[in-house]
């Protein structure tokens, strides 16, 4: 109620002889400040005097003086809220009740605190979790209801008398609520800790033993097992017997069931601590263990690897990789179940033993077609030699080999013939599926690997074929050697280099571009008349009569070819000039007379000149000289001269006679 002073402090404090007591304490007076404080030991209220009797351990007065005998007890409080006390050292006879007599100006109060001082240091108390399981972390707590600033202590953990390696966390409390020292240890117990003694030891600052508490660990764990095997190395041969025994070295709580496992799978009807295997087979090789269960769970023994030894089984060959491409790498692996592992291998290629090959693997760095075939092997160990298995087939793939282009026709081939070629090869893997031909043409392929060229051209020189599977292999080109009549026959003038003038030396050449066979004959012809049989036609001194249309022929064993007609043109100065007169060389005066200068010239006459009997040139330059009307004075001899680019020619004299007309005669 509101008429009480309010105090807070631990209800009881514990200590031992020679230690100290620190009493945390707070208060709140009803009115004003504290004026008087007396600490009693076991105070008794005296009704007669209305005062408390008892040993006064501490007394403070208004002037604040403290008697010298009170040095052991110290009031560490103040006048309004702190009432903390210290007793150092504390003695056994300090046990009992401490009375704090507080007086303010108008109010009084007696506060009681219990003090329990033991003769020797009292033991700490170990607190354990309700259940401890192996490998599960637990916290062990050691609690001592003591702490005092003037008396340092330490708590140490021991397991079977040996300090524990794990780090403990120590904490102290000196508060109005509680006074204690506590050590906490985090610890993962193993099954082997079961039944072991854990000690919490109280020591002074120098590590001197003061007291301790001990507990026995009850670590729940699955059964711990040991497996024993006869024979001890667990290596036997087919037909031998094997005994395995399972021993429980520890179980908490007690075990309930037993079973045996092989390669992790439970063996049926095997629920005793002994496993008997009679006349073992190789299938019984494996990892064995026993399993025993309790309420915590199943425990398993270590595994025993039972090896049932046997001679190698029939072997198989694994090829990496088949089919293989020529030139690539290949590896063979001989696989055979055996125990112990095979120590020696014998390899066979197409049934023939490969000398010097005794390893499990055979490596070919560069495969060739001759490596193809069936590979088999035999494995051998200390117990015997296995059988040869069926073997594995190595397929070596390669491009077609020795490809040739073959001409099927009888030779020689003539232009226009139908030519048949075939593409042949020696071997191929995989099979040839198609063929290619060079050069490409609009040719027939009547069947695979056969080429038909209809109407073969003179210029079809070489043909090559390729046989193809996954790869193409080309043959060397084959020459068709097509025979044909001479081609592009033409007449060519060799000399002179310029135009042909009458009297020149002239050479004509019969040219052709090609001929197969090369041996040829030549023929020259003019107007259907044979002129010569050489490649050249020569004229020492050409005459205009040699002009005309010439052809040459070239022939070989295949046929003959004519050139186009070639016109030979001879240039010459005007010749055979003569003056012709029309209507005649006798003309009556008054009539018309026409003189014509006739000539033979190449090129034709370009310019004419007329002359009279006095060799006087007349002012006329055309081919015809027209006299109209003709006069008697015109009578006389005339001649003409013709000119072309080559030269000039003149005619002989031609006489014109002009006679008088009857009229003139009549007038005379």
């Amino acid at each position: 109620d509101s008429s009480k002073w309010v105090f807070e402090h631990p209800e009881t404090l514990y200590a031992w002889e020679g230690a100290c007591v620190w009493i945390p304490c707070t208060y709140r007076a009803l009115d004003g400040d504290l004026e008087s404080f007396i600490l009693f030991h076991n105070p008794e209220y005296n009704k007669n005097t209305s005062k408390f009797d008892g040993t006064r351990l501490y007394e403070s007065t208004k002037d604040g003086k403290v008697p010298s005998e009170q040095k052991r007890v110290q009031f560490l409080g103040d006048k309004n809220k702190n009432c903390t006390l210290s007793i150092h050292p504390v003695h056994l006879n300090d046990s009992g009740q401490l009375g704090l007599r507080m007086e303010s100006k108008t109010e009084k109060w007696m506060e009681r605190i219990h003090l329990n001082v033991s003769e020797r240091p009292f033991p700490p108390h170990i607190q354990l979790p309700p259940e401890i399981q192996e490998s599960q972390e637990v916290t062990l707590t050691c609690l001592l209801n003591f702490s005092c600033y003037g008396y340092p202590i330490q708590l140490q953990w021991l397991l079977e008398g040996v300090p524990m390696r794990q780090a403990a966390v120590t904490s102290t409390s000196l508060t109005i609520k509680s006074v204690f020292t506590r050590s906490e240890l985090k610890f993962s117990p193993q099954w082997s800790h079961h039944g072991k003694i854990v000690t919490c030891q109280l020591q002074d600052a120098d590590g001197k033993f003061l007291s301790n508490d001990t507990v026995q660990l009850n670590v729940k764990h699955t059964p711990k097992l040991e497996i024993k095997v006869t024979p001890s190395d667990a290596i036997v041969r087919e037909g031998d017997s094997v005994t395995m025994t399972c021993e429980v070295s520890s179980s908490n709580p007690e075990y309930t069931t037993v079973s045996w496992l092989k390669d992790g799978t439970s063996l049926k009807k095997q629920n005793t601590f002994t496993l008997n295997l009679r006349e073992v087979t190789k299938d019984q090789s494996g990892k064995y263990c026993c399993q025993v269960s309790n309420d915590v769970g199943p425990g398993r023994s270590e595994e025993v690897f039972l090896q049932v030894q046997y001679a190698p089984e029939p072997s198989t060959v694994q090829i990496l990789h088949s089919p293989a491409v020529e030139g690539s790498q290949v590896e063979f692996l001989c696989m055979s179940l055996a125990n112990p592992l095979p120590t020696n291998y014998t390899w066979y290629h197409n049934g023939k033993e490969m000398q010097g090959r005794t390893e499990e693997k055979v490596h070919i760095p560069k495969i060739l077609p001759w490596h193809a075939g069936t590979y088999s092997c035999v494995a051998e160990n200390i117990l015997g030699t296995g059988q040869r298995g069926p073997g594995a087939e190595l397929d070596v793939q390669y491009p077609p080999k020795k490809v040739t282009t073959v001409i099927q026709n009888p030779m020689p081939i003539r232009e226009g013939d139908t030519v048949t070629l075939s593409c042949n090869y020696n071997s191929s893997n995989p099979s040839v599926t198609r063929y290619e031909w060079k050069p490409h043409g609009a040719w027939e392929e009547p069947s695979l690997g056969v080429l038909k060229i209809q109407n073969v051209g003179w210029d079809n020189t070489t043909i090559a074929c390729a046989a193809c599977n996954s790869w193409c292999s080309w043959a060397s080109p084959v020459a068709l050697n097509v025979q044909y009549a001479p081609r592009d026959v033409r007449v060519r003038k060799i000399k002179p280099l310029s135009e042909i003038h009458s009297g020149n030396s002239v050479s004509l050449q019969c040219d052709f571009s090609s001929s197969h066979p090369k041996e040829v004959q030549f023929f020259w012809e003019k107007n259907g008349r044979l002129l010569g049989k050489e490649s050249q036609l020569n004229f020492d001194s050409i005459s205009p009569e040699d002009a005309g249309s010439y052809s040459c022929w070239v022939n070989n064993s295949i046929g003959q070819t004519a050139s186009k007609a070639w016109t030979l043109e001879v240039l010459y100065a005007p010749r055979r000039l003569r003056v012709s007169m029309s209507p005649g060389d006798q003309v009556m005066e008054g009539k018309s007379a026409t003189l014509t200068c006739e000539s033979d010239a190449n090129p034709p006459v370009s310019h004419y000149t007329w002359f009279d009997w006095n060799n006087q040139s007349l002012p006329y330059h055309s081919q015809k000289l027209r006299l109209e009307p003709v006069k008697v004075q015109h009578s006389g001899a005339y001649w003409c001269q013709g000119t072309n680019s080559v030269g000039k020619g003149r005619s002989p004299l031609s006489t014109l006679t002009v006679y008088y007309s009857p009229e003139t005669i009549g007038r005379r």
Partner: nanobody, 122 residues
Framework: QVQLVESGGGLVQAGGSLRLSCAAS????????MGWFRQAPGQERRFVAG????????VYADSVKGRFTLSRDNAKNTVHLQMNSLKPEDTAVYYC???????????????WGQGTQVTVSS
């Protein structure tokens, strides 16, 4: 085309040495195996020694073990048969042959050299 050319044969005194060589060209070189055989007059061809081009050690007939040494020179596509402590019974025509593997039977060899005469006189 495969060609095998032997060389190094000749006449030697008993206890002497000879070195036979076999040069391979074409398919026989570089991959597969080379074998040496010998044929004494009136007898069958018998296996003497063999070696693979790519890997592995040589293989010898019991009659020549410890006396003959077979080696290969891959760079020159040549195998050499070093014959020491020669005996008169080693007299024969020596042939080199090519096959995919070292076989002991001459029937399993596809290509043969022309042979070289070795005569050991006592």
């Amino acid at each position: 085309q495969v060609q095998l050319v032997e060389s190094g044969g000749g006449l030697v005194q008993a206890g002497g040495s000879l070195r036979l060589s076999c040069a391979a060209s074409g398919r026989a070189s570089g991959s597969g195996a080379m074998g040496w055989f010998r044929q004494a007059p009136g007898q069958e061809r018998r296996f003497v020694a063999g070696i693979e081009w790519s890997s592995g050690g040589p293989v010898y007939a019991d009659s020549v073990k410890g006396r003959f040494t077979l080696s290969r020179d891959n760079a020159k596509n040549t195998v050499h048969l070093q014959m020491n402590s020669l005996k008169p019974e080693d007299t024969a025509v020596y042939y080199c042959a090519a096959a995919p593997w070292v076989f002991s039977s001459p029937d399993d060899y596809m290509y043969w050299g022309q042979g070289t005469q070795v005569t050991v006189s006592s």
